[in-house]
């Protein structure tokens, strides 16, 4: 009956962690002796390349400096104690500890056999290492110019994450990748690029990480600050305003980062009626007269800059009763 | 303590048969296989076969397989390598040895002159 | 079968030397190869297995080396103990064959 060697194709391995490489001698054969176990990596220079052996009677050794014996353990092999028994050795699962960059590669678990000679599979060891994930916004100014406005980091990944975004703004990410403090690992950033706008400012965007060191990607979600200056415009106006209303009201509304630290309110004119009184952001009417046949200008500043709005005032004589009823602000 | 203890020399004629024994104690007999391996006067090591006391199974040497016939018995813990045709080429010691690993424990050797 | 050649057939050294004997197989072994010493009149024992393991109890002035067909039996520091026949086996493949062997003389 023939034997076989039962090993996994690849496993994979926690940078730092411990791992496992499954070797197993199937099927069990009466009178089939196992002389030998050694574990091999074909790929290393010639003097590291023997990893580990394990003999009958002499139990483990472990040659090579790399990884060494402080890091190396036969799981389930056991030595024959005495010489009343034979050694365990069907199982040659081989424990890696402290897992480095230098322990990926290629292992080999051989069984020398009586009768049947020698059999051997091979087991493609990975080192993996899981990424510290952070992402956050750039306090940015308007511009016309691409600016980032939000940086996703996968710290210390091996391999490299994948960053993406998820956002339904007109944006591009630009991506630079550093060796990690960690020998082997790989730090990735991913920096979201677009015009800063008032349009983006509050807007949350979603950086996705995908590694496969984890079960699904992670999504992290990032909302944008852009400091722009006041976007204004002016509401309370409804087309009805007569000579001697008394109940209007013009708003000067407002979106702006950071918030409006002065209202001004102006008329086109240079004419400013004396019954219309400026409460910051809005400007209260006592008595509609005919000097409100004008363009009131509303102008807000922040510390970006400022903003201005516009609305003209058509003043009836009589009020228009077709219309809606008077909306006063 | 393993030990292998092996019958005393033999002188034969040619084309007469040898049969020499290998006496073994200090560990589970039938759970290791014994080998025989002989010597020829100044010459190197030569693997002839071997036998499994446990289920009786042998294997050899495709060089031997027609002369020679190893045997074990439980009951005695003893195994047995019988060469026939014998010529004076097989003059040798030949060895009974017992594989741990690699052929740790050996018989004293056993002297066997083929002479007309 | 697997053919152990072995070189040199006889070697003569002073004590403190380092020698080297070597044994080439005729198709690859991996590292399935033991060292045998044999002193006058008595069976073989084992110096190195896996072709670079040291057997326990052997001084580690004996080191093995090589993987595949060739490899190398080195004594860093001859002793006068040293004085024996030594041997290459393969147990890669069924028959086991031996190298047919070294003979070490001190001077």
């Known amino acids: 009956q023939d034997v076989r060697v039962q090993v996994l194709p690849e496993v994979r391995g926690q940078l730092g962690g411990t791992v496992e490489l499954p070797c197993h001698l199937l099927p069990p054969v009466p009178g089939l002796y196992i002389s030998l176990v050694t574990w091999q990596r074909p790929d290393a220079p010639a003097n590291h390349q023997n990893v580990a052996a394990f003999h009958p009677k002499m139990g483990p050794s472990f040659p090579s400096p790399k990884p060494g014996s402080e890091r190396l353990s036969f799981v389930s092999a056991k030595q024959s104690t005495g010489q009343d028994t034979e050694a365990e050795l069907q199982d040659a699962t081989l424990a890696l500890h402290g897992l480095t960059v230098e322990d990926e590669g290629n292992y080999t678990c051989e069984f020398a056999t009586f009768p049947k000679g020698s059999v051997r599979g091979m087991t493609w060891l990975r080192v993996i290492a899981k990424p510290k994930n952070q992402a956050e916004a750039q306090k940015v100014t308007f511009s016309q110019d691409p600016t980032t406005v939000a940086l996703c980091i996968s710290k210390e990944g091996r391999p490299p994450a994948r960053i993406s975004w998820l956002s339904s703004l007109d944006w591009e990410a630009k991506e630079t990748q550093v060796s990690g403090t960690l020998a082997g690992t790989v730090t990735v950033t991913s920096r979201f690029t677009l015009v800063p706008s008032g349009r983006a400012d509050g807007v949350t965007v979603t950086c996705k990480v995908e590694h496969e060191s984890f079960e699904e990607p992670a999504l992290i979600p990032v909302t944008l600050s852009v400091r722009y200056p006041p976007e204004v415009s002016i509401s309370g106006y409804d087309d009805n305003w007569y000579l001697g209303r008394t109940d209007a009201t013009l708003s000067c509304d407002v979106r702006s980062n950071p918030e409006p630290t002065g209202y001004d309110w102006s008329t086109t004119s240079g004419t400013f009626p004396t019954s219309a009184v400026a409460q910051g952001s809005q400007l209260v009417i006592h008595a509609v007269d005919s000097l409100f046949n004008t363009t009131f200008v509303c102008t807000v500043t922040n510390a970006v800059g400022m903003g201005r709005a516009e609305q003209v005032i058509f003043v009836r004589e009589t009020p228009n009763t077709a219309g809606a009823g008077a909306t006063g602000g | 303590e393993v030990q292998l203890v092996q019958s005393g020399a033999e002188v034969k004629k040619p084309g007469s048969s040898v049969k020499v024994s290998c006496k073994a104690s200090?560990?589970?007999?039938?759970?290791?296989?014994i080998h025989w391996v002989r010597q020829p006067p100044g010459k190197g090591l030569e693997w002839i076969g071997a036998v499994y006391p446990g289920n009786s199974d042998s294997n050899y040497n495709q060089k031997f397989k027609a002369r020679a016939t190893i045997t074990a018995v439980t009951s005695t813990s003893t195994a047995y390598m019988e060469l026939s045709s014998l010529r004076s080429e097989d003059t040798a010691v030949y060895y009974c040895?017992?594989?741990?690993?690699?052929?740790?424990?050996w018989g004293q050797g056993t002297t066997v002159t083929v002479s007309s | 079968d697997i053919v152990m050649t072995q070189s040199p057939s006889f070697l003569s050294a002073s004590v403190g030397d380092r020698v080297s004997v070597t044994c080439k197989a005729s198709q690859n072994v991996g590292i399935n190869v033991v060292w045998y010493q044999q002193r006058a009149g008595q069976p073989p024992k084992t110096l190195i297995y896996s072709a670079s393991y040291r057997y326990s109890g052997v001084p580690d002035r004996f080191t093995g080396s090589g993987s595949g067909t060739d490899f190398t039996l080195t004594i860093s520091s001859l002793q006068s103990e040293d004085l024996a026949e030594y041997f290459c086996?393969?147990?890669?493949?069924?028959?086991?064959?031996f190298g047919q062997g070294t003979k070490l003389e001190i001077k």
């Open positions: 200090g560990y589970i007999f039938t759970s290791y296989w």
């Open positions: 086996q393969q147990y890669n493949t069924n028959p086991f064959t």
């Open positions: 040895t017992k594989l741990v690993g690699t052929f740790d424990y």
